[in-house]
């Protein structure tokens, strides 16, 4: 159970006092306050919100609250020269133009400074040419086009539907295929759930709605001009030609009304199979180009956005620990939004605000956490996780020595069906134990635990009677803490029923229609799911900051390491002949995993038995737990991805949002049959097995008895 030496509240009541102080009504009030105007990164509106949060966190009782600013590369549309796409006839006349803005939702008609839909960091350009429909623009979609259908995208403008993978991966794939422009659109198959009305009458995407978003391929670099180092006032900045991760071809997003006008004229090849068809009344022909009558017409993009070094502001609040002030538990989520941010990020920011208020209330009553808690309101997450990454770069030496855990707090909801958790295996037991103590908010589960409803609705594919917990990928502010610094991390939110709702994300994601009313009317009128997420996130932070022994179970890492080793071995075994030819063996990896399992088991036994009243031994054991995640970091990073340094987990090279296990080996094996030099390719597989085996063994040894 939680305990703390420095409190005047009985230890067993600490967590209860904290959780009882969290109120749904407050979260609702905070959400309303945070969503009345846009808070785009780099604007005065967002700076004012930063100052408001700073002021309120001080009032709530934090020891200190500071603004940390950085000057980073952002991207904005040209205010006087809007972006759009045309269909042009043989004379070059524009016979159709896409819309310049989304029709504003009811009640927001008079709001200024709504940034029109754009793809952040698109270069300028006015390419024109034939269109090719590339489905979701995934790696496998381009394989299908190029290898099976023999369709060449070189010099073409490609149109891809949003969904399945991070948009930056789509653009990278299109670039590699030789495309000269990319049009991204939201297909109703992915963003319009059957039987639900479009906003404002329901939570579906209207035809004029458009998803904004950045199209970078940063691979964890942060500010594109200052990779590895903070974008402070004396920073050396790269030239734009050397900037990290910028796309090289113009990109623009549109809604499905405009997409219909482009896709209905498509000719050329028929779609290869039904998985390439969306829900529009169009043939989903792949192209290239328009059909017969329209074959002389072309598509032209008009992109005039600019990249600008802009000041951003994080808010960093500190609640000093009473016993171990040099150990940091961090709760962070972003503040910047594309427009109103009704879900992303303010449903998360409102929860963080209430968690801070609750902690502050306890502190005012004389309580302090055992360890220091840092609260962060990150800026410019939407532009590539920039605020969190720059702050972590600036504070990396402190964080790598003192960072216990990072809990992410972006959108609290993406649905209202069940809980969704992604975290390090070290936190599995913490999450299980916590959710067993919390009440489920779900209908039909009154009086039951959150663990029970979660397990019923989202069962683990491997272990019966347990809920699914996913791998951490990226696309959010935990990235730098986990993937670069090796700080144990986790995230939790309420999600949809993935089995019945096969659309990507939630329909109104990053559109102007992501408003307070969307949440209050359609997702969570009672704010009970928000409250549950506050309890999960806040409860995790409380336990991590307050438990005498850190609530990490290293045995759960052993279990997943074996699972991941089995998985990567089975992928490799699809090439038995080559494995034999090039003497590829996984013995070293399986041996390391076995050693890890045995050492972790022994460590856990010692953890039960040691003298917890001896502060030196306690600190020693806790440090072994804290530094275990750090031990999976390879200082050299992954091939061509120096800021992804975690050997067990990395964002997938094909989808930034997804986590991949043993990513070094996985990428070395990917499409290996097509490599021009098989000997070199299999040599890299062997090298990656070696790196993984060494890292697992080295991590195991950090858990051994110290002497």
């Amino acid at each position: 159970k939680s305990s703390n030496e420095a409190t005047n509240i009985t230890p067993k009541h600490n967590m209860k006092a904290f959780l009882d102080e969290l109120k749904a009504e407050n979260i609702k009030k905070f959400l309303y306050n945070f969503t009345q105007i846009p808070h785009l990164a780099g604007t005065e509106q967002n700076f004012q919100l930063a100052k408001q949060i700073q002021s309120q966190w001080k009032e709530f009782g934090l020891d200190s609250v500071e603004l940390a600013h950085y000057d980073v590369l952002l991207s904005y549309p040209n205010k006087t020269h809007p972006n759009y796409i045309s269909i042009i006839n043989e004379d070059g006349n524009e016979i159709f133009n896409t819309s310049l803005f989304e029709p504003p939702p009811p009640g927001y008609e008079n709001v200024s400074d709504i940034v029109p839909p754009f793809s952040a960091f698109s270069p300028q350009g006015m390419p024109e040419g034939d269109l090719v429909y590339v489905n979701y623009a995934r790696t496998e979609d381009f394989f299908k086009l190029e290898r099976d259908m023999k369709i060449n995208c070189s010099g073409k403008i490609v149109i891809a539907r949003y969904g399945k993978v991070f948009r930056g991966n789509k653009v990278k794939n299109a670039q590699l295929a030789g495309a000269k422009g990319v049009i991204l659109y939201s297909d109703p198959a992915d963003y319009f759930a059957p039987g639900v009305k479009s906003y404002p009458d329901g939570w579906n995407l209207p035809g004029g709605g458009v998803q904004r978003g950045n199209i970078l391929n940063l691979n964890g670099a942060g500010d594109p001009l200052t990779p590895g180092y903070p974008a402070n006032e004396y920073a050396y900045r790269r030239g734009i030609a050397e900037a990290v991760g910028l796309p090289s071809i113009p990109v623009h997003p549109i809604g499905y009304y405009d997409a219909q006008k482009l896709l209905e004229k498509m000719g050329g090849s028929a779609p290869p199979d039904s998985s390439w068809r969306g829900s529009l009344k169009v043939p989903y022909n792949v192209g290239p180009g328009f059909t017969g009558n329209f074959s002389t017409q072309k598509v032209k993009m008009h992109i005039h956005s600019t990249n600008e070094v802009t000041r951003i502001y994080n808010v960093i609040g500190t609640l000093r620990g009473a016993v171990e002030p040099d150990r940091y538990v961090i709760l962070g989520g972003h503040r910047d939004s594309w427009v109103f941010g009704g879900i992303d990020p303010q449903s998360g920011a409102a929860v963080v605000h209430e968690i801070v208020r609750s902690f502050g209330t306890l502190k005012k009553e004389g309580w302090r956490p055992r360890r220091t808690i840092l609260f962060a309101s990150w800026d410019a997450e939407e532009f590539g996780l920039l605020g969190s990454t720059e702050w972590a770069e600036e504070n990396s030496r402190l964080l790598q020595e003192r960072g216990v855990a990072y809990i992410n707090a972006d959108s609290s909801i993406e649905g209202n069906y069940t809980l969704r958790v992604d975290c390090t295996p070290l936190m599995y037991s913490l999450v299980h134990n916590l959710t067993k103590e919390l009440k489920s908010p779900d209908e039909g589960f009154e009086g039951k635990s959150l663990y029970e409803s979660w397990t019923k609705k989202s069962p683990s594919p491997e272990f019966s009677g347990m809920p699914r917990i996913s791998k951490l990928g990226s696309g959010n502010d935990f990235e730098v803490f986990f993937q670069r610094l090796g700080i144990a991390s986790g995230r939790a939110r309420y999600t949809k029923n993935w089995e019945t709702n096969k659309f990507s994300g939630y329909p109104l994601y990053h559109s102007v229609y992501e408003t307070y009313e969307l949440v209050e009317k359609f997702y969570d009128p009672m704010f009970k799911y928000h409250l549950t997420v506050a309890q999960v996130r806040g409860g995790m932070v409380f336990e991590l900051a307050n438990s005498i022994v850190l609530p990490f179970d290293c045995r759960d890492y052993a279990v997943v390491l074996r699972k991941y080793a089995d998985k990567i071995y089975s992928i490799s075994m699809k090439h038995p002949q080559e494995m034999k030819t090039y003497s590829v063996s996984f013995d070293s990896l399986f041996s390391a995993v076995k050693n890890f399992t045995e050492i972790a088991s022994k460590f856990s036994e010692r953890l039960q038995d040691f003298d917890k009243s001896n502060p030196i031994v306690l600190r020693m054991m806790n440090d072994q737990l804290m530094f275990l995640e750090r031990a999976f970091i390879d200082p050299l990073g992954l091939p061509d991805r120096p800021f992804y340094r975690h050997v067990i987990y990395a964002p997938s090279s094909h989808n930034k949002y997804a986590g991949e296990s043993f990513p070094g080996i996985y990428d070395a094996l990917f499409d290996i049959e097509s490599k021009v030099d098989p000997s070199k390719a299999w040599g890299e597989v062997k090298r990656q097995i070696y790196v993984a085996a060494f890292t697992v063994q080295a991590a195991a040894e950090t858990l051994s008895e110290v002497a």
Partner: antibody
Amino acid sequence: EVQLVQSGAEVKKPGASVKVSCKASGYTFTSYGISWVRQAPGQGLEWMGEIFPRRGNTYYNEKFRGRVTMTTDKSTSTAYMELRSLRSDDTAVYYCARVFDGYYNYAMDYWGQGTTVTVSS
Amino acid sequence: DIQMTQSPSSLSASVGDRVTITCRASQDIGSSLNWLQQKPGKAIKRLIYATSSLDSGVPSRFSGSRSGTDYTLTISSLQPEDFATYYCLQYASSPYTFGGGTKVEIK
């Protein structure tokens, strides 16, 4: 407390130049720009342009382009506005005002006390 | 350039009166409009930004509203310290332009 303190009154002859200063305090100078606005006797306000010290960018009202130069000295948190080829109708009170440095802003929030420039032969 | 037509150019009122001042924009400026107060010998003060948001320290008797391209500053109950000249400012597009001003005098 945010303060913008401007230099004293100036009397200039037609054809001469004037350089007005605006010393800022109470905030991070590089997080904001400085706008310059003038007001002729008995007249309304007229925006001349703005400068953003962090980036060094200037944006001038076309009416004054070629005659006005706005600069800053970050080490002293001071902005300057120089107007050349003065004419009698340049006689006015010249104000500096703070403006947030960002893609969207709310324009001028704090103003200096004004500097009277008289152009007379 | 966007023209801002402010009316009336002057008005006389008594303490406690409700006063309204209007600015009409020659084209759409959204909510990118501020209201400023100028008193002789004092620095200009911003009262309202973004059409209706009150600056900190400004009394709640001041309010701003919009109907189409017409923008209104209302003083619900005029106080002695409110006698001054008021200007609107549009900052939707450069060059930023001001209304001609309204002088509020004691009746």
